[in-house]
Interface confidence: medium
């Protein structure tokens, strides 16, 4: 069953989704779609990333986190009741049927008063997850193909950046995470 998230009309909604890239220079494509995850791809795509950046988006939908470190959480600006429903976050791991799919249910509540748009998050569910930063090794090579090597200094740097970034705050929130490799 889907994990449920809530936001009020006029607010920004936040739908968390995470994975851990094996290396920062070669990402796993991700798509976000309106509707439950189908067998392949995403239906009604609202945003898509490729191996390097966001290559498709529609208005009001964007990634506010550091998606190059795996924070592919979706922000929907200024939501209306029509934004209610199931959203699919699909981590498109190379290989047959390797994709990780997460269905997230967004419930929009009518505003009690006319609110100024905020970026506050209102969560109704949480489940445990793990985020790791690690080097480039045989498992990643096998899973993802050609990736830049990443040395210990880079791992340390990435770990520090991760700790300093808003992604660290997101770790305290709820969301979906997949570890690659």
């Amino acid at each position: 069953s889907e994990v449920e998230y809530r936001a009020e009309v006029g607010q920004n909604a936040y739908l968390p989704c995470f994975y851990t890239p094996a290396a920062p220079g070669n990402l796993v494509p991700v798509c976000w779609g309106k509707g439950a995850c189908p067998v392949f791809e995403c239906g009604n795509v609202v945003l898509r990333t490729d191996e390097r950046d966001v290559n498709y988006w529609t208005s009001r939908y964007w990634l506010n986190g550091d998606f190059r470190k795996g924070d592919v959480s979706l922000t929907i600006e200024n939501v209306t009741l029509a934004d209610s429903g199931i959203y699919c976050c699909r981590i498109q791991i190379p290989g047959i049927m390797n994709d990780e799919k997460f269905n997230l249910k967004l419930v929009i509540k009518p505003a009690k008063v006319t609110p100024a748009p905020t970026r506050q998050r209102d969560f109704t569910a949480a489940f445990p997850r793990m985020l790791t930063t690690r080097g480039h090794g045989p498992a990643e090579t096998q899973t993802l193909g050609s990736l830049p090597d990443i040395n210990l200094t880079q791992i340390s740097t990435l770990a520090n950046e991760l700790r300093d970034s808003r992604l660290a705050n997101d770790l305290r929130d709820s969301g979906a995470t997949i570890r690659i490799g």
Epitope: G25, N26, R52, D53, N64, R68, G145, S146, P148
Partner: antibody, heavy 120, light 107 residues
Framework: QVQLVQSGAEVKKPGASVKVSCKAS????????MDWVRQAPGQGLEWLGY????????SYNQKFKGRVTMTTDKSTSTAYMELRSLRSDDTAVYYC?????????????WGQGTTVTVSS | SIVMTQTPKFLPVSAGDRVTMTCKAS??????VAWYQQKPGQSPKLLIY???NRYTGVPDRFTGSGSGTDFTFTISSVQVEDLAVYFC?????????FGTGTKLEIK
């Protein structure tokens, strides 16, 4: 230390092609993206595209699609940018720039630039 | 394409001044913004990456901040050697785009 050394200035006629080279040293060439950026006289910076030497993956600015090709020679750690069907407004300094150590998406080392003049 | 609107175009300064320039993205780019310095006849130099991270060896008088659509670059105490053109760049989505530049000039 990291160095990107580009080929010399070129003067071309409209309709011709130019191929600029960028020889990298001081780091593992295949580990980093190489982007190409140009700057018209007195103007700002314009991104042309990138190549990832590891797997020869490329992405081009739609504005130049069909006219630009980026390649690499791993044996010599050299990146190339070819621009075809040159027009006078292609007159610019062309830079190769390495995707950064801390951020693959901003450029921590740049070549010295290659001036391409398109004139009849 | 994402448009990066950089202001001001020219910034008259004296040594020791605190100066601020801004970049506004036409849509949210998260924290995927870099700032570069370019002196006449030279290649650009990276100063700030991911909006607020100072690149190695860059003096701490240079700072960047912002996320989403609004970004700020500040020099806390301008030195003579800082006279240059400063560019912002978004690297959220290709084509990566640059601001038009802010030129620091002697007042």
């Amino acid at each position: 230390q990291v160095q990107l050394v580009q080929s010399g200035a070129e003067v071309k006629k409209p309709g011709a092609s130019v191929k600029v080279s960028c020889k990298a040293s001081g780091y593992t060439f295949t580990d980093y993206y190489m982007d190409w950026v140009r700057q018209a006289p007195g103007q700002g910076l314009e991104w042309l595209g990138y190549i990832y030497p590891n797997n020869a993956g490329t992405s081009y600015n739609q504005k130049f699609k069909g006219r630009v090709t980026m390649t690499t020679d791993k044996s010599t750690s050299t990146a190339y940018m070819e621009l075809r069907s040159l027009r006078s407004d292609d007159t610019a300094v062309y830079y190769c720039a390495r995707g950064g150590y801390y951020s693959y998406y901003s450029y921590d080392y740049w070549g010295q630039g290659t001036t391409v003049t398109v004139s009849s | 394409s994402i448009v990066m609107t950089q202001t001001p175009k020219f910034l008259p300064v004296s040594a020791g001044d605190r100066v601020t320039m801004t970049c506004k993205a036409s849509q949210s780019v998260g924290n995927n913004v870099a700032w570069y310095q370019q002196k006449p006849g030279q290649s650009p130099k990276l100063l700030i990456y991911y909006a607020s991270n100072r690149y190695t060896g860059v003096p701490d008088r240079f700072t960047g901040s912002g996320s989403g659509t609004d970004f700020t670059f500040t020099i806390s105490s301008v030195q003579v050697e800082d006279l240059a053109v400063y560019f912002c760049q978004q690297h959220y989505s290709s084509p990566y785009t640059f601001g038009t530049g802010t030129k620091l000039e002697i007042k």
